[in-house]
């Protein structure tokens, strides 16, 4: 047991925030300043990442973890550990290489990101529309015209007329 | 370099449904960009399915999107496509691919793999 | 939807001809001075390949003989000296609003 102890890797005891120092006989040193060590045994601490630009901090870093970025407001985090920002869009818009979109007339986007999609096309459940799509909203599906009892109006307004294109704002 | 391989395929009753893979390698499908299933019946053109995002966001073909369901698992870096209630129609090449940051083109495509719908 | 009509279905052509191919949307696919319309080459059993984006942005690694151009909803793509492995099917798509869709191919044979 005291051989295989000898033998063992004298770095494996240093903990978290700390690293083995070659330079200083393998003793466990404080991962300095502006670094960290997540895990026991590391021969060298990591830089922390700095959160900078559109960048903000979302939780500072230790001795023990990293840094975490979040974006700044008009900005949404993309990618695992939110590795870039992407700029926000307005609901009723969709986020091109040219910038903020407008949906087009028969779609929507009720969310600041993503693509408009299109609205949903009542007659394929049978259904009738209930209340019109917008660039915002998708439409409300109601029951279908069968379904109304006799006498009862539906209440779907008449379809709107194609839109002309516009501008982003 | 990306490179991205479909599996799944093969020969699958009418009414039945499937399931195909994408593994991607080279890159990881969690990275912001979009992630697409794209197909080509025998001697016809493309036809496009589905994209999702980074998150999660899914983005049907409209005349197929009742049979649709597009998903990923990031820790296997994989992409999916569920399709249900088969038909001969069905019957094609399917490719997984990826797109750009906006859900737009595509610049790298897998190999494809065939699906045989038939009794 | 937004239709892309590609003319011709398919041609016939020499090594060494310039050869142009049209897409046709049914509505425009610009925004902003911008094109959403890319173009893609597929040779039997592969997969497509990317060439142009954006209208007319060749994609890193395919050979300049390749341009596009257009705007609005009538678009080019124009091989100035058909090689031998330029011989496959071509596709346009617009990405300018979902669905995303294809044009239906022209097919680049040997004369």
């Known amino acids: 047991f005291e051989r295989t102890r000898s033998l063992q890797d004298p770095c494996s005891n240093c903990p978290a925030g700390t690293f083995c120092d070659n330079n200083r006989n393998q003793i466990c040193s404080p991962c300095p300043p502006n670094s960290f060590s997540s895990a026991g045994g590391q021969r060298t601490c990591d830089i922390c990442r700095q959160c900078k630009g559109v960048f903000r901090t979302r939780k500072e870093c230790s001795s023990t973890s990293n840094a975490e970025c979040d974006c700044t407001p008009g900005f949404h985090c993309l990618g695992a550990g939110c590795s870039m920002c992407e700029q926000d869009c307005k609901q009723g818009q969709e986020l091109t290489k040219k910038g903020c979109k407008d949906c087009c007339f028969g779609t929507f986007n009720d969310q600041k990101r993503g693509i408009c999609r299109p609205w949903t096309n009542c007659s394929l459940d049978g259904k009738s529309v209930l209340v019109n799509g917008t660039k915002e909203r998708d439409v409300v599906c109601g029951p279908s015209p069968a379904d109304l009892s006799p006498g009862a109006s539906s209440v779907t307004p008449p379809a709107p007329a194609r839109e002309p294109g516009h501008s982003p704002q | 370099e990306v490179q991205l391989v479909e599996s799944g395929g093969g020969l699958v009753q009418p009414g039945g449904s499937l399931r195909l893979s994408c593994a991607a390698s080279g890159y990881s499908i969690s990275s912001g960009h979009y992630w697409g299933w794209i197909r080509q019946a025998p001697g016809k053109g493309l036809e496009w399915l589905a994209l999702i995002d980074w998150y999660g966001d899914k983005y049907y073909s409209t005349s197929l999107k009742s049979r649709l369901t597009i998903s990923r698992d990031n820790s296997k870096n994989t992409l999916y496509l569920q399709l249900n209630s088969l038909r001969a129609e069905d019957t094609a090449v399917y490719y997984c691919?990826?797109?750009?940051?906006?859900?737009?083109?595509?610049?790298?495509w897998g190999q494809g793999t065939l699906v045989t719908v038939s009794s | 939807d937004i239709q892309l009509t590609q003319s011709p279905s398919s041609l016939s052509a020499s090594v060494g001809d310039r050869v142009t191919i049209t897409c046709r949307a049914s509505e425009s696919v610009d925004f902003d001075g911008f094109s959403f319309l890319a173009w893609y080459q597929q040779k039997p059993g592969k997969a497509p390949k990317l060439l142009i984006y954006d209208a007319s942005n060749l994609e890193t690694g395919v050979p300049s003989r390749f341009s596009g151009s257009g705007s609005g909803t009538d678009f080019t793509l124009t091989i100035s000296s058909l090689q031998p492995e330029d011989f496959a099917t071509y596709y346009c798509?617009?990405?300018?609003?979902?669905?995303?869709?294809f044009g239906q191919g022209t097919k680049v044979e040997i004369k």
């Open positions: 798509q617009q990405y300018d609003t979902l669905p995303r869709t």
């Open positions: 691919a990826r797109s750009d940051y906006y859900g737009s083109h595509f610049d790298y």
